[in-house]
């Protein structure tokens, strides 16, 4: 049975086996095509989601689809139902929390009262001044809180208490990539993790431990990427894994927050990386223990210099490392989070690519998560 499952796939009507390597190869090998059903699926980038949250106290902004302008939501007459609508528009199904925050002196956008129309937020038709003088601060999910704060040193062993959103993504029980829990159903990782194996069946997620082999595996229902372009293989290196059953959150299993749309991190901003990846370039083995390291944002201009990546780092990517080199993510860390701490922890990057590991002029390159918020929200909405 184990051997059969490992090497063969059972087609129904009529029942017969096909070699597992024929799964997800683009050919219908089973009469009903079920060999092509549970495969990595692509999902287009899609339209702008008409709500977003700003780094200014997680304040809600809404797009006026008639004029193409963003405006800030006034707290006047804002209700729980409107908060739920806003979060549903971003694909969240959890119960949101909201509060009033004072309009600051630097308020840039128009502040307008909100109403709802066919499950979408709209500006109220005769919206005059914002009488409360307050904006809506909205949180769609409690996220980014851990039981333990890491200490700032080079590379050290990590505890799951510090990083309860970190998961191991495994194929045939072998660790392939890292990933981050975003909500009870969804894990964020890198698309390149699935280049070799595009069938969903054998992929599993392990959450809740800092040791590689010691935690139960979770079944995966779907793996979603943006269309792969072989001309630009490093682009759009982002994937979402939908779990078959929702996670139960605990001290060691918790979600990390997505970044704000306007989360612009300046060079030298401190960040954290974690993973079970190789501890030495071109060799060694996966670390059994989760490792953590502090790094910093490296300026994109520096990262694209002639002695570095020569223009390969696009505006949807970011670089992080330490100027002198030696601290970096490596093979096996792919898909894991690059993290920034403000009030909560945010996943600002996904471990993606780099030349070697830890070289001074070639730091790690990460998928910039804020560039893909619309895509994430559109995927979630489609799966609600």
């Amino acid at each position: 049975k184990v051997i059969l499952d490992k090497y063969y796939f059972l087609c129904g009507q009529p029942l017969h086996f096909i070699p597992r390597k024929q799964l997800c190869d683009g050919e219908l090998d089973c009469p009903l095509g079920e060999d092509e059903e549970h495969c990595v699926k692509s999902f287009p980038e899609g339209p702008a989601v008409a709500v977003r949250l700003s780094k200014d106290r997680s304040t809600l902004q809404v797009l006026d689809s008639a004029t193409g302008n963003w405006f800030s939501a006034c707290f006047d007459n804002f209700t729980e139902a409107l908060a739920e609508t806003a979060c549903r528009q971003m694909g969240y199904s959890s119960k949101p929390t909201f509060r009033a925050v004072e309009i600051g002196p630097d308020q840039d956008l128009d502040v307008v009262e909100i109403t709802e129309n066919s499950q979408e937020l709209r500006m109220r038709n005769s919206s005059g001044p914002c009488l409360s003088g307050s904006l809506v601060s909205l949180h769609c999910l409690a996220c980014g809180k851990s039981l333990k704060t890491p200490r700032v040193v080079g590379v050290e062993e990590a505890s799951v208490d510090s990083w309860p959103w970190q998961v191991s993504i495994q194929y045939d029980k072998q660790h392939v990539c890292g990933g981050s829990i975003l909500d009870p159903h969804w894990v964020l990782t890198a698309a390149h993790c699935f280049r070799k194996h595009t069938d969903v069946f054998n992929w599993k997620v392990r959450a809740g431990s800092d040791k590689l082999g010691s935690f139960p595996s979770l079944a995966v229902a779907k793996i979603i990427i943006i269309e792969f372009n072989p001309m630009y293989p490093k682009d759009n290196d982002i994937a979402l894994m939908k779990l078959q059953f929702p996670l139960t959150f605990s001290g060691t299993v918790r979600p990390i927050c997505l970044p704000f749309f306007d989360e612009e991190l300046t060079p030298a901003t401190p960040l954290w990386i974690i993973g079970w990846g190789f501890t030495k370039q071109n060799g060694g083995k996966m670390s059994d223990i989760l490792l953590q390291a502090s790094v910093q944002v490296i300026d994109s201009t520096r990262c694209n210099a002639d002695d570095a990546y020569q223009g390969e780092v696009t505006e949807k990517m970011m670089c992080a490392g330490i100027p002198e080199g030696g601290v970096d993510t490596c093979q096996g860390d792919s898909g894991g989070p690059l993290m920034y701490q403000s009030d909560q922890w945010h996943v600002v990057g996904i471990v993606s690519w780099g030349y070697g590991c830890g070289g001074p002029s070639t730091p790690g390159v990460y998928t910039k998560v804020s560039a893909y918020l619309n895509w994430i929200y559109n995927v979630w909405k489609a799966e609600l």
Epitope: L63, T67, D108, N125, G128
Partner: antibody, heavy 118, light 107 residues
């Protein structure tokens, strides 16, 4: 303080081309739609074109459709109007204006004069 | 396209007078109507937005009213600096359209 500064106006022959620029500062340019509005000498205001905050949608007045192209570079905080096949009736002061949420135009540039004449 | 018709096209008044300018839309524009003041050689200045909301920094002698298709701009007690051209504008739908203007002159 919000500032909009147009440039690129001048004298051009009928059938010629001109590119206007509008440099924006003092606000989050990438969150606002931007407009061009013109005013012929001694006449009223005429809306010309709008571009959405991210450049994803553009709309034009019938009088300029197919001849004028609005564009923006959010990394440079700059709005553009490429004007081709210019006619005498395009002679006007061209203003850029920051889009507001259906609340009219609170912020305008000082205007740049385009004269189409042989 | 929505046509905006202002009346009168021009009017003469004295300092201290109460003046009313009307604007009619060819179809319903809700309350998405703005009023501007323009002086020669200058860019227009926003006075009223959303039909009746006073733009900050604009004197309270200016007021707006109306919704749907009929709108009014009222200047309660004319001051010397109020002599200018006034425009209404709808932002309910694209293309955005302006009224032809009302020139307010000193009597």
């Amino acid at each position: 303080e919000v500032q909009l500064l147009e440039s690129g106006g001048g004298l051009v022959q009928p059938g010629g081309s001109l590119r206007l620029s509008c440099a924006a500062s003092g606000f989050t340019f990438s969150s606002y739609a931007m407009h061009w509005v013109r005013q012929a000498p001694g006449k009223g205001l005429e809306w010309v074109a709008v571009i959405w905050y991210d450049g994803s949608s553009k709309y034009y007045a019938d009088s300029v459709k197919g001849r004028f192209t609005i564009s923006r570079d959010n990394s440079k905080n700059t709005l553009y109007l490429q004007m081709n096949s210019l006619r005498a009736e395009d002679t006007a002061v061209y203003y850029c204006a920051r889009g507001e949420v259906r609340r009219g135009f609170q912020h305008w540039g000082q205007g740049t004069l385009v004269t189409v004449s042989s | 396209d929505i046509q905006m018709t202002q009346s009168p096209s021009s009017l003469s008044a004295s300092v201290g007078d109460r003046v009313t300018i009307t604007c009619r839309a060819s179809q319903n524009v809700g309350s998405w109507l703005a009023w501007y003041q323009q002086k020669p050689g200058k860019a227009p200045k926003l006075l009223i937005y959303a039909a009746s909301s006073l733009q900050s920094g604009v004197p309270s002698r200016f007021s707006g009213s109306g919704s749907g298709t009929d709108f009014t701009l009222t200047i309660r007690s004319l001051q010397p600096e109020d002599f200018a051209t006034y425009y209404c504008q709808q932002s309910y739908s694209t293309p955005i359209t302006f009224g032809q203007g009302t020139r307010l002159e000193i009597k």
